[in-house]
């Protein structure tokens, strides 16, 4: 398991002893008395696995330490960075003849990743490593590690991998970190073209020609090319690309559209602000996402505002006539910002004992003019069962309702068929007319057929022709209709409701508001 350590972008690490959790487990020869794996603490008090040897007493030391197999990942030249601490022989009295202050670095190429033994003859020497700064007293105690860092390179390599080896010849040394890496020209973007990670060439003077590909949402103008140098730097850019959808050119780059902006097509245009009720959630949007509760229909253009389903229809009125029901309603207060509003009728048949247990009415029920896609605000439902509870739902729908169906878009009424509703009211009177109000009074129906629970007054401006009406309900046989417009003709209908349902509306009473209050007695006919 390795932890992440940050290195320059143009270096790819093949081995990092500091990133290994637990023992390194490299092979030492001899197995005992030579290199030894020891855990020390770094400046942050975290353990570091090191290899140490300090056989300074005897001459002719030949202690070898070999790494595990290191894959070369296609690299032809690799670099070895060694961080080590070397103890000054002067700090070890009486060992001047046998103590050394250098060690040797070797490598061996191999396709075999499981070689168990060190065969010294197979290894080629890279270099003798000496300390730039050896020391007499140790600096680990105050948590400041004074380390020597030496970097060597080797190549060209051709086999799948290689082993490194360290030969101690009698030094007092600790290998604190061994890192093996190769150099690459890192993925980069120049002139709107992206150039991939490219491993450097085999020798220190080679240039590798690389063809670039246009950045996302851009297209070629001239073929983009660059050269990867041996030090991992890109050289001599040629060619370029043009910005595409979701991006605009800024400072010579294709920059993603900012949040709240989008660009739908490949053009030279800048990014545009998202249409109403939409937003972009990330940079580089080619379209904008609708706000919560807002949607686009399939055939809506990306530049169109997002819309939402309509609110519920208003003022649902039912009229039961034996096994038929007439329903009327008003348009929703909110159409969701769309013109394509229509209505669907849902019929449910409910049990008398438990009204909550309802099921669909089935195909035997008929609707005039139709059940779904109604453009008018009324429907007649026939062929219902007698003595049965029905719940009718009127759903307002538009082009985006399917994306968010909700009970908030419907209004319902429950009726019982084949029960006697009250008869219609024969006489409605306007008791007082002012500029802004009309006081109405009426008589109880000739046939109440039960206890009258309430009266319902429907009224509308005469020239609206019942397209937009209002409803007032009252338990009394009179009411004041307020908030009217002066010098305007209104039509009033009244009906009674019992437990059996609503009766028919009365004949219309037409009243014109005026400028001077006067008492007018209506007889059910037109009054002015």
């Amino acid at each position: 398991v390795t932890g992440s350590r940050v290195y320059p972008a143009n270096e790819v690490t093949l081995l990092d002893s500091r990133s290994v959790q637990g023992e390194l487990g490299w092979i030492a020869s001899p197995l005992e008395g030579g290199w030894e794996e020891v855990s020390i603490m770094d400046e942050k008090n975290t353990p570091i696995r090191t290899y140490q040897v300090c056989n300074v007493m005897e001459a002719s030391q030949n202690n070898w330490l070999r790494t595990d197999w290191i894959t070369r990942e296609g690299a032809q030249r690799v670099y070895i960075e060694i961080k080590f601490t070397l103890r000054d022989c002067n700090s070890l009295p009486g060992v001047m003849g046998t103590c050394k202050e250098t060690f040797n670095l070797y490598y061996y190429e191999s396709d075999n990743d499981k070689e168990r033994f060190i065969r010294e003859s197979q290894f080629g020497k890279i270099d003798t490593i000496a300390a730039d700064e050896s020391f007499t007293q140790v600096d680990i105690g105050d948590r400041i590690m004074k380390l020597n860092t030496e970097i060597r390179d080797v190549g060209p390599l051709s086999k799948k991998g290689f082993y490194l080896a360290f030969q101690d010849v009698g030094a007092c040394i600790a290998l604190v970190s061994v890192r093996v890496f190769y150099k690459k020209c890192p993925l980069t973007v120049r002139n709107l073209a992206q150039f991939p990670d490219t491993i450097t060439g085999a020798d220190t003077s080679s240039l590798v020609e690389v063809r670039g590909s246009c950045v996302n949402n851009s297209e070629e103008k001239d073929v983009p090319k660059m050269y990867c140098g041996a030090d991992g730097e890109w050289l001599v850019p040629i060619g370029n690309c043009l910005c595409n959808a979701g991006h605009e050119e800024q400072n010579g780059e294709c920059q993603a559209c900012k949040i709240g902006y989008y660009k739908a097509l490949s053009t030279d245009a800048s990014c545009a602000k998202c249409p109403p009720h939409s937003y972009s959630v990330w940079e580089g949007a080619t379209s904008c996402t609708c706000d919560r509760g807002f949607f686009r229909a399939d055939n809506d253009a990306a530049s169109m505002p997002c819309t939402r389903p309509p609110s519920a229809p208003l003022n649902l009125i039912s009229n039961v006539n034996e096994t038929s029901v007439n329903l009327e309603w008003s348009s929703p207060q909110n159409t969701g910002g769309r013109q394509d509003i229509s209505y669907n009728v849902v019929c449910k048949k409910c049990g008398a004992g438990d009204p909550s247990k309802c099921r669909p009415c089935g195909s035997g029920v008929h609707y005039t003019p139709q059940q779904n896609g109604l453009k008018t605000t009324r429907v007649s439902i026939t062929d219902l069962l007698a003595h049965t509870n029905y719940t009718f739902e009127i759903w307002a729908v538009n082009g985006v309702s399917k994306y968010n169906p909700s009970p908030d878009q419907s209004v319902s009424v429950t009726v019982t068929t084949n029960q006697a509703a009250p008869s219609s009211i024969a006489l409605v009177q306007a008791k007082e007319v002012t500029r802004y109000s009309v006081a109405l009074a009426w008589l109880e129906p000739d046939r109440p057929n039960g206890v009258i629970l309430e009266y319902e007054v429907k009224y509308y401006e005469k020239d609206q022709n019942e397209r937009s009406y209002r409803i007032v309900r009252t338990a009394a046989r009179n009411t004041d209709i307020k908030g009217l417009n002066p010098l305007t003709s209104y039509v009033f209908h009244v009906r009674a409701r019992t437990a059996a349902g609503y009766g028919d509306f009365s004949e219309p009473l037409e009243v014109t508001t005026n400028t001077v209050p006067s008492r007018i007695i209506g007889d059910g006919a037109n009054s002015t």
Partner: antibody
């Protein structure tokens, strides 16, 4: 396994000499230095010095008198501590201990069981 | 010559408690001391040496830290077998021991 074997207790008269052997086994004798430490009764540890077992070169503690001599017989993997002109204050347990050199500092990682030298008239 | 002073002379702790032993050098040193444990009638045993490295077989409840002149040996949870005398030892051209700290049962 690695061990250091010391001789049994010695009782000496003042002015006499004593030679304390320390026989090593389980490792290459000449690869590690040997240190000598003494501990007077009820007292702490006192480092006396060490000897390079490869070259025979000794290093004595500061202030050490010439009465202490470290020597070797590598053919039998044995280090010796010789004390001459013994005094009553030389009464102590004498330990040999193998030295562990490392780049980050030194320690004595294997100890003999100690030899009690008693100087009494 | 560097003089090492250990404190306290005696430390009374109960098993399971944390024990902190101090070792102060008479002048600043750039290397951590070695630490030894000695039980009555036995030879000392190396606990910790260069760069706070535990010797072979020493449990990880023993740890050492410090810099300059002040160094510490910590026993995170004292076990019954840890009651003993502990010595710090400075290495260099001449080696010296501290006078020892006795860790006893409270």
């Amino acid at each position: 396994q690695v061990q250091l074997l010391q001789s049994g207790a010695e009782v000496k008269k003042p002015g006499a000499s004593v030679k304390v052997p320390c026989k090593a086994s389980g490792y290459t004798f000449t690869s590690r230095a040997m240190s000598w430490v003494r501990q007077a009764p009820g007292q702490g540890l006192e480092w006396m010095g060490w000897i390079n077992t490869n070259t025979g070169n000794p290093t004595y503690a500061q202030g050490s008198t010439g009465r202490f001599v470290f020597s070797l017989d590598t053919s039998v993997s044995t280090a010796y501590l010789q004390i001459s002109s013994l005094k009553a204050e030389d009464t102590a347990v004498y330990y040999c201990a193998r030295v562990r050199f490392t780049v980050y500092g030194d320690g004595m990682d294997v100890w003999g069981q100690g030899t009690l030298v008693t100087v009494s008239s | 010559e560097i003089v090492l002073t250990q404190s306290p002379a005696t430390l009374s702790v109960s098993p399971g408690e944390r024990a902190t032993l101090s070792c102060r050098a008479s002048q600043s040193v750039s290397s951590n001391p070695a630490w030894y444990q000695q039980k009555p009638g036995q030879a000392p045993r190396l606990l910790i040496y260069g760069a706070s490295t535990r010797a072979t077989g020493i449990p990880d409840r023993f740890s050492a830290s410090g810099s300059g002149t002040d160094f510490t040996l910590t026993i995170s949870r004292v076990e019954p077998e840890d009651f003993a005398v502990y010595y710090c030892q400075q290495y260099g051209p001449s080696w010296t021991f501290g006078q020892g700290t006795k860790v006893e049962i409270k």
